[in-house]
């Protein structure tokens, strides 16, 4: 039910990467506007994106309050210029989103190799610890702060002159690997959350190769 000149939102979809979280929906509004509400299972509804003509709403500020909570959102449809109007049941038309648990479901963003340093036959590869919008004590937490040992990085590395790859893993942001002296190597990393069953892996980082500016070589 609802007013004759509004349609309910549909295809409500959470888009979330490294906890930056946006709710998207359809359709593009024609003579109507939307308001979004979000709550935890046990909490009160909080309104966001009031009377918007957009079909997305950034809910990051709400979900980062507790990324382990499960959230539900709903999108209300109102006639443009008459937002007091309600449906025949005395309430505006709305549609519920799927449930969303940020800690379990946010996509892992593409990681970045921050640096690599060769010392003799060892190379230390460091992965950038990306800052998230999750806060604790007024400080933004990094991805490692949020996930702790539940975040693993997988390193792929190979000689520039060969196609045979090797791999290593770390639950910190640093790798220390053995290399052959005098050989240049290329590196790529991938983030993984082992405890998950979906959205477990990030895309691969851009490839970085020795002999380029990110690295440093020291003969010891």
């Amino acid at each position: 039910s609802g007013t004759t000149n509004t349609v309910a939102a549909y295809n409500l979809t959470w888009k979330s990467t490294n906890f930056k979280t946006i709710l998207e929906w359809e359709p593009k509004p024609v003579n109507q506007v939307y308001t979004v509400q979000i709550s935890t299972k046990s909490g009160d509804w909080k309104s966001k994106c009031f009377y918007t003509t957009d079909t997305e709403c950034d809910l990051t500020d709400e979900i980062v309050k507790d990324v382990k909570q499960t959230y539900l959102a709903r999108v209300f449809s109102y006639p443009a210029g008459n937002v007091e109007s309600t449906g025949s049941a005395g309430e505006p038309l709305y549609e519920n989103s799927p449930e969303f648990t940020p800690y379990l479901e946010t996509n892992l963003g593409q990681p970045t190799i921050q640096s690599f340093e060769q010392v003799g036959t060892k190379v230390n590869v460091t992965v950038e610890d990306e800052r998230t919008l999750v806060r604790r004590n007024n400080t933004f937490l990094s991805l490692r702060d949020v996930f702790g040992k539940d975040l693993i990085y997988t390193l792929y590395y190979w000689k520039s002159s060969s196609s045979g790859k090797k791999t290593a893993k770390t639950n910190t942001n640093e790798f220390l690997i053995d290399v052959d002296k005098g050989e240049n190597y290329c590196f790529s990393v991938q983030a993984v959350i082992p405890s998950r069953t979906v959205n477990r892996k990030s895309t691969d980082s851009p490839v970085e190769c020795m002999g380029q500016e990110k690295g440093e070589f020291r003969e010891i």
């Epitope: 693993i152 993984v192 082992p194």
Partner: antibody
Framework: QVQLVESGGGVVQPGRSLRLSCKAS????????MHWVRQACGKGLEWIGL????????IYDPKFQGRFTISADNSKNTLFLQMDSLRPEDTAVYYC??????????WGQGTPVTVSS | DIQMTQSPSSLSASVGDRVTITCKAS??????LNWYQQKPGKAPKLLIY???SLADGVPSRFSGSGSGTDYTFTISSLQPEDIATYYC?????????FGQGTKLEIT
Amino acid sequence: QVQLVESGGGVVQPGRSLRLSCKASGFNIKDYYMHWVRQACGKGLEWIGLIDPENGNTIYDPKFQGRFTISADNSKNTLFLQMDSLRPEDTAVYYCARDNSYYFDYWGQGTPVTVSS
Amino acid sequence: DIQMTQSPSSLSASVGDRVTITCKASQDIRKYLNWYQQKPGKAPKLLIYYATSLADGVPSRFSGSGSGTDYTFTISSLQPEDIATYYCLQHGESPYTFGQGTKLEIT
């Protein structure tokens, strides 16, 4: 529930090729790293290699590089092991396994391969 | 490549005994070590991961310890159903390597 079922094993002559399959159910292989491991009769376990089915990255034990090829068909949720130039010492039971990054949590039942003339 | 030296290769013990198996890595594997149990004709079964963590559904008589290059697997009180071959596996870097295995028998 999660299940891995290998197939394609059998008796093959030295120098010939064989392709093993590992059909996964209960999860998407592209969400995990997938491995092949083998075990000769009465011997220990031997790691062959892994694939990330999402991007096709493969890693092999150097002793198998060039002769064995791991691939995946995500649409069929199936892992493959192509074995070329087979030798009698490749006679073994071949297992596929799922890797959650801290451990191999599910294994297939194994498929036996015998290389003999 | 990392070599894993597992000992002993075989072991005979009585029901109720405490049983210990060791794996020594040729370099630091940063606790990326698992212990598996394998019974004849069956696939390996995970017992311990990340050197010390007990896998789901595994009895508490099984435990693991160690870090760096030296790792230990212990059965605190051997049961008849523990008769099997046990393997360690390092997966910190490729090529992943298994220990040679320890065949456990009951006297």
